[in-house]
């Protein structure tokens, strides 16, 4: 807490300018009028205040607006936004996309903080829906934001937004989300050539159907085991040994280390043992030679 002290003679701030960087914390508290600060917030971001000085400026705004800052102030918070707590932000009513962009810009290049998450939540709730413009803005700043949306919300994501997604941004997506995102990614990257296409689509393949995996197996993509292990089990099961071998290329040797884990374990159980033996990896658990395999799902469809 900053001490309440009188402003020294001649130090009363007439405007928010760079001369204030030389003010001690107590001088800022005593000599800067909160209303002046609020009307000239756009200048604060251009002035190299220290974090301690920013604490004082925030304190002055908090006193002036105990119920929450008006949007005219919020839009110009700049780096002062980094000083806000989620509790502060919950008092705000942010309706302008420009305000949202201005604050996201401050946090650009960093992980989504609790402050940003709260800001986005307040903004989306204030708008009543997640419209395309908002989503474009959020995915531009935080591609990982996609994984925090429900499959229903993801259905409105434009394929163009997919271009901004980095592989690590999908780490927290579950299969239901990837089911929605994969077709959009496929559409977004459809005009790329084979190897470039695979690089881009790879992180979305957790939502790929069997037929797309079969198609990829014909393109010498050399999928790594980490990607293979994230594929949908139901999409992997129908693949033949030959198709998996082509899909993985030199990485096929990694199957041995993963033979106890899904989806490899389930896939092995569906393959003939003599087919598995052709891989020369010592994979065990396939259908013994001479056994007849009935596809019950097909039988049900025919009856």
């Amino acid at each position: 807490e900053v001490e309440k002290t009188a402003c020294p003679s001649g130090k009363k701030a007439r405007e928010i300018d760079e001369s204030l960087i030389f003010y001690k914390k107590w001088e800022l508290e005593a000599c800067v009028d909160a209303a002046l600060l609020a009307t000239q917030m756009d200048r604060v971001n251009a002035i190299p205040f220290t974090y301690e000085q920013l604490d004082v400026l925030k304190h002055k705004l908090d006193e002036l607006y105990p119920q929450g800052y008006p949007e005219s102030v919020i839009q110009h918070l700049g780096y002062l936004f980094l000083k806000m707590s989620p509790e502060d932000i919950r008092k705000w009513n942010v309706t302008s996309l420009e305000t949202l962009k201005a604050l996201l810009e401050v946090n650009k290049g960093h992980e989504m903080s609790p402050q940003v998450a709260t800001l986005i939540d307040r903004f989306v709730k204030g708008r009543g829906q997640l419209d395309k413009d908002t989503l474009d803005t959020l995915t531009a700043f935080y591609p990982g934001y996609l994984c925090s949306l429900s499959p229903e919300e993801l259905s409105s994501v434009p394929p163009s937004s997919i271009w901004a997604v980095r592989p690590q941004d999908l780490d927290t997506c579950d299969p239901r989300q990837l089911d929605v995102l994969y077709p959009k990614a496929r559409l977004a990257f459809q005009n790329m050539n084979g190897s470039e296409y695979f690089v881009k689509i790879q992180s979305f393949l957790g939502g790929a159907p069997t037929e797309d995996l079969k198609a990829l197996s014909q393109q010498n993509v050399s999928m790594d085991l980490a990607t293979f292990m994230k594929l949908r089990t139901d999409a992997v099961l129908p693949l033949t040994v030959a198709e998996v071998q082509k899909l993985l290329g030199p990485h096929v040797e990694g199957l041995k280390a993963e033979e106890r884990h899904r989806p490899v374990r389930d896939w092995i159980l569906r393959q003939r043992q003599d087919d598995l033996d052709t891989l020369g990896l010592g994979l065990q658990g396939g259908i013994p030679n001479g056994y007849l395999v009935l596809d019950l799902s097909m039988q049900e469809a025919l009856s």
Partner: antibody, heavy 120, light 107 residues
Framework: QVQLQESGPGLVKPSQTLSLTCTVS??????????WSWIRQPPGKGLEWIGY???????YYNPSLKSRVTISVDTSKNQFSLKLSSVTAADTAVYYC????????????WGQGTLVTVSS | DIQMTQSPSSLSASVGDRVTITCRAS??????LNWYQQKPGKAPKLLIY???SLQSGVPSRFSGSGSGTDFTLTISSLQPEDFATYYC?????????FGGGTKVEIK
């Protein structure tokens, strides 16, 4: 580590302008965490703070010398400079440049100092 | 301006002695006080900042205390290299000001 080195004439005539330059090495003068100060010490006496500058060019001077002092910065050369006009014998002193930690205003490191004598 | 008064202005002590130097500010300066050591012909060297924080590389026999208007620099066991002049400096308000100095001499 950061080192500071003062340079300039050791003798200045009364009424003329004293000019000194401080060259910073081992670190950038554009660091946002520091001010760059000038401090002087008359022979056998104590220390007097003259003023400081931020890399952006903003300055703050000791009111007792404000009318005669100009501090400037050249970030491209990693230097800052002092000009003291209308000097008298009372301005004879060892002049130090120093790095000043923002918020707490402690001086570290200092230059080795340069004696400036005002005499005709 | 804030005036800084040091006492004593000089003192004589022997190696191994415990030495205490005091600094008083003309108004409360919280913990905005720094201590420096200066040897003849040399620039001052920062010992203590923010009243009690030991600067990196400074021997632990040096310590600082105090808050408000009264501050103390203590050398727990005086060493030959500690004979020098010591200055306090307030950084609570500009202009930044120094105490008049305390000269520690060999007894």
């Amino acid at each position: 580590q950061v080192q500071l080195q003062e340079s300039g004439p050791g003798l200045v005539k009364p009424s003329q302008t004293l000019s000194l330059t401080c060259t910073v090495s081992g670190g950038s003068i554009s660091s946002g965490d520091y001010y760059w100060s000038w401090i002087r010490q008359p022979p056998g006496k104590g220390l007097e703070w003259i003023g400081y500058i931020y890399y952006s060019g903003s300055t703050y001077y000791n009111p007792s010398l404000k009318s005669r002092v100009t501090i400037s910065v050249d970030t491209s050369k990693n230097q800052f400079s002092l000009k003291l006009s209308s000097v008298t014998a009372a301005d004879t002193a060892v002049y130090y440049c120093a790095r000043d930690r923002r918020d707490w205003d402690w001086f570290d490191p200092w230059g080795q100092g340069t004696l400036v004598t005002v005499s005709s | 301006d804030i005036q800084m008064t040091q006492s004593p202005s000089s003192l004589s002590a022997s190696v191994g002695d415990r030495v205490t130097i005091t600094c008083r500010a003309s108004q409360s300066i919280s913990s905005y006080l720094n201590w420096y050591q200066q040897k003849p012909g040399k620039a001052p060297k920062l010992l203590i900042y923010a009243a009690s924080s030991l600067q990196s590389g400074v021997p632990s026999r040096f310590s600082g205390s105090g808050s408000g208007t009264d501050f103390t620099l203590t050398i727990s066991s005086l060493q030959p290299e500690d004979f020098a002049t010591y200055y306090c400096q307030q950084s609570y308000s500009t202009p930044l000001t120094f105490g008049g100095g305390t000269k520690v001499e060999i007894k």
